[in-house]
Interface confidence: medium
């Protein structure tokens, strides 16, 4: 599986209290089970959404409603492929205090889309 994190830089800096959406694109697999991981622990998100771009291309989403200090860390996505776990390149999420101007490089794979999630 060609696994890559789409539309996110290696380092992502956001202001405290702001929302963040991460996209993970998986190519070369049919119906992958995309899981998000933060600092080694799977991120529970009951409304985990996947968009099929094509039969062999899927995008998974992780959305944080309101970023706080505890959300800072290293994020990646992973899929199981033939009994082996493949992981994406990580993204480091760092915070600046509320009201500061964050150098926000985050770019959505489809910036116009709105994907319902539970995290603010």
């Amino acid at each position: 599986a060609g696994l890559k994190l789409m539309g996110a830089p290696v380092k992502l800096t956001v202001s405290q209290g702001q929302p963040v959406k991460l996209n993970c694109s998986v190519e070369g697999m049919e119906e992958p089970d995309i899981q998000w991981v933060k600092d080694g622990a799977v991120v529970q998100n009951l409304d985990q959404l996947y968009i099929p771009v094509s039969e062999q291309h899927w995008i998974g989403f992780l959305s944080l409603k309101s970023v706080e200090r505890s959300d800072a860390g290293r994020y990646w996505c992973q899929v199981e492929d033939g009994g082996e776990t493949e992981i994406s390149q990580p993204v480091w999420l760092t915070l600046v205090p509320r009201g500061s101007s964050a150098h926000h490089h985050h770019h959505h794979h489809h910036s116009a889309w709105s994907h319902p999630q539970f995290e603010k």
Epitope: Q44, L46, E68, S114, P116, E119, K120
Partner: antibody, heavy 125, light 108 residues
Framework: EVQLVQSGADVKKPGASLTISCQAS????????ISWVRQKPGKGLEWMGQ????????NYGPSFQGHVTISADRSTATAYLQWRSLEASDTAMYYC??????????????????WGPGTLVTVSS | SYELTQPPSVSVSPGQTARITCSGD??????AYWYQQKSGQAPVLVIY???KRASGIPERFSGSSSGTMATLTISGAQVEDEADYYC???????????FGGGTKLTVL
């Protein structure tokens, strides 16, 4: 057209086992999660749990953990809710629910939630 | 276990603004969804992600969230808006979801 077809109403005695079903059509079954919601007569909605069919990953509400089992059969695009031993307090309407996206003309997919019509389960001696 | 708290009932006259609240400790971090259920029918999604109106829902329905409180507002309530309304969200760690107890809206 997206459809969730639920199995018909059922009457059981306490202690009996039961499985109700929710068959999906009109979309790729494994795209999104399916959840189950209980509504006792004249009462509110209760989230029971859900399954991600592609991985058969499940989550349960604290009140339902250990009392029901949620499963899915990808070959028939069907989700199931199962009891090993029913109690009178399980008498309720049970709904299955799933989200889906639909793009109508533009590039922005609209978010929908589809609810099945419900299955009425009556447990009585 | 995690709970979402709603008032049992809200009454307004036709044309007035109805506000239904939902409080929960995790709402600063978790989005609220709102459902409308009319008698004998399955619920219908009204608002998702705090404030986004679901497809086919009239513009008089709006949602907002601040701190531990989410609010569903119906501006200019109509008789046909009489229904039970439920908020819905997740507990803080995302392990399970919950519905609020429901609010019966009466439009007299």
């Amino acid at each position: 057209e997206v459809q969730l077809v639920q199995s018909g109403a059922d009457v059981k005695k306490p202690g009996a086992s039961l499985t109700i079903s929710c068959q999906a059509s009109g979309y790729t079954f494994t795209d999104y999660w399916i959840s189950w919601v209980r509504q006792k007569p004249g009462k509110g909605l209760e989230w029971m749990g859900q399954i991600v069919p592609r991985a058969s990953r499940t989550n349960y509400g604290p009140s339902f953990q250990g009392h029901v089992t949620i499963s899915a059969d990808r070959s028939t695009a069907t989700a199931y809710l199962q009891w090993r031993s029913l109690e009178a307090s399980d008498t309720a309407m049970y709904y299955c629910v799933r989200p889906y996206f639909q793009t109508s003309g533009g590039t922005i997919p609209e978010y929908y939630q589809h609810w099945g019509p419900g299955t009425l389960v009556t447990v009585s001696s | 276990s995690y709970e979402l708290t709603q008032p049992p009932s809200v009454s307004v006259s036709p044309g007035q603004t109805a506000r239904i609240t939902c409080s929960g400790d995790a709402l600063p971090k978790k989005y609220a969804y709102w459902y409308q259920q009319k008698s004998g029918q399955a619920p219908v999604l009204v608002i998702y992600e705090d404030e986004k109106r679901a497809s086919g829902i009239p513009e008089r329905f709006s949602g907002s969230s601040s701190g531990t409180m989410a609010t569903l507002t119906i501006s200019g309530a109509q008789v046909e808006d009489e229904a039970d309304y439920y908020c819905y969200s997740q507990e803080r760690n995302g392990n399970y979801a919950v519905f609020g107890g429901g609010t019966k809206l009466t439009v007299l």
